[in-house]
């Protein structure tokens, strides 16, 4: 089995709207073009600040709630999935 | 490990430009944005902007829209800051930081004095 | 251009838990503000805590931690420690550019 473990346990404020987003896009003349803005990609922060946290699992980034997650091995549990379970 | 190496101190003429760098090491600056604050003598911190170094990409500040230049080399990791027109008003530290969704990772700063 | 307001300071004990908030001129901070909260420290020494209203920086200790408190972005330190004293800043995104509030210069006695 796999456990996903919260790195913090997210917002209950979800009125988060799509067009914004820490990344910067470069400014487009003739105004801003809300599509391209929202469809750029953004980068990963498991490929960046947070590569070596998770210990014993996967990070997982949640684009949409801007919220790192560690997906735990079998049998570790915990924030970075460094806690061993006694089975 | 981690860090951020600012360009040393500049005095530099009212009315001139300076570019101030900031070197990457322990982590590739194109995984990163890279952002520019400035701070003045006993007040808080000013966002100028940041940039994607990957593509290029930049955002800058209202205030600094047209006066800063943000560039980036992936080859030597190091990111560029470039102000123009400088007056007393940017008498200040200027810092560099790093990160994705977090201001992870934060440069010394660089002193930046304007002389008349 | 928005404004993002903190408190100018509190003084908090040793062990004790302390909120810090980071409100914005243009209505209730929300999770699409992307709340980033930085700690100075004297001689100019910048530390990242949070980032996207929840996430702590990786090695940053677990007593602090990053919500939204009713309209408002907030930093908590659950059990504050001496070494805590520090100026923190918030900062906001909006749409395309971010705003940093004054600062928080927080003590512990």
């Known amino acids: 089995s796999v456990r996903v473990e919260q790195v913090v346990k997210p917002p209950q404020n979800k009125t988060e709207s799509e067009n914004t987003s820490d990344k910067p896009k470069r400014k487009k003349k003739g105004g801003k073009n809300g599509k391209n803005r929202r469809n750029r990609k953004k980068k990963n922060p498991c490929n960046a600040e947070f590569q070596n946290f998770c210990i014993h699992g996967e990070c997982k980034y949640i684009e949409h709630l801007e919220a790192v997650t560690c997906k735990c091995q079998q049998e570790y549990f915990g924030e970075r999935c460094g806690e061993k379970s006694m089975k | 490990e981690v860090q951020l190496q600012q360009s040393g101190a500049e005095l530099v003429r009212s009315g001139a430009s300076v570019k101030l760098s900031c070197t990457a090491s322990g982590f590739n600056i194109k995984d990163y944005y890279i952002h520019w604050v400035k701070q003045r003598p006993e007040q808080g911190l000013e966002w100028i902007g940041c940039?994607?170094?990957?593509?290029?990409?930049?955002e800058y500040a209202p205030n600094f829209q047209g006066r800063a230049t943000m560039t980036a080399d992936t080859s030597s990791n190091t990111a560029y800051l470039q102000l123009s027109s400088l007056t007393s008003e940017d008498t200040a530290v200027y810092y560099c930081y790093g990160g994705t969704i977090t201001f992870a990772y934060w440069g010394q700063g660089t002193l930046v004095t304007v002389s008349a | 251009q928005a404004v993002v307001t903190q408190e100018s300071a509190l003084t908090t004990s040793p062990g004790e838990t302390v909120t810090l908030t980071c409100r914005s001129s243009t209505g209730a901070v929300t999770t699409s503000n992307s709340a980033n909260w930085v700690q100075e420290k004297p001689d100019h020494l910048f530390t990242g805590l949070i980032g996207?209203?929840?996430n702590r920086v990786p090695g940053v200790p677990a007593r602090f931690s990053g919500s939204l408190i009713g309209d408002k972005a907030a930093l908590t330190i659950t059990g504050a420690q001496t070494e805590d004293e520090a100026i923190y800043f918030c900062a906001l995104w909006y749409s395309n550019h971010w705003v940093f509030g004054g600062g928080t210069k927080l003590t512990v006695l």
């Open positions: 996207g209203t929840i």
């Open positions: 940039i994607d170094p990957e593509n290029g990409d930049t």
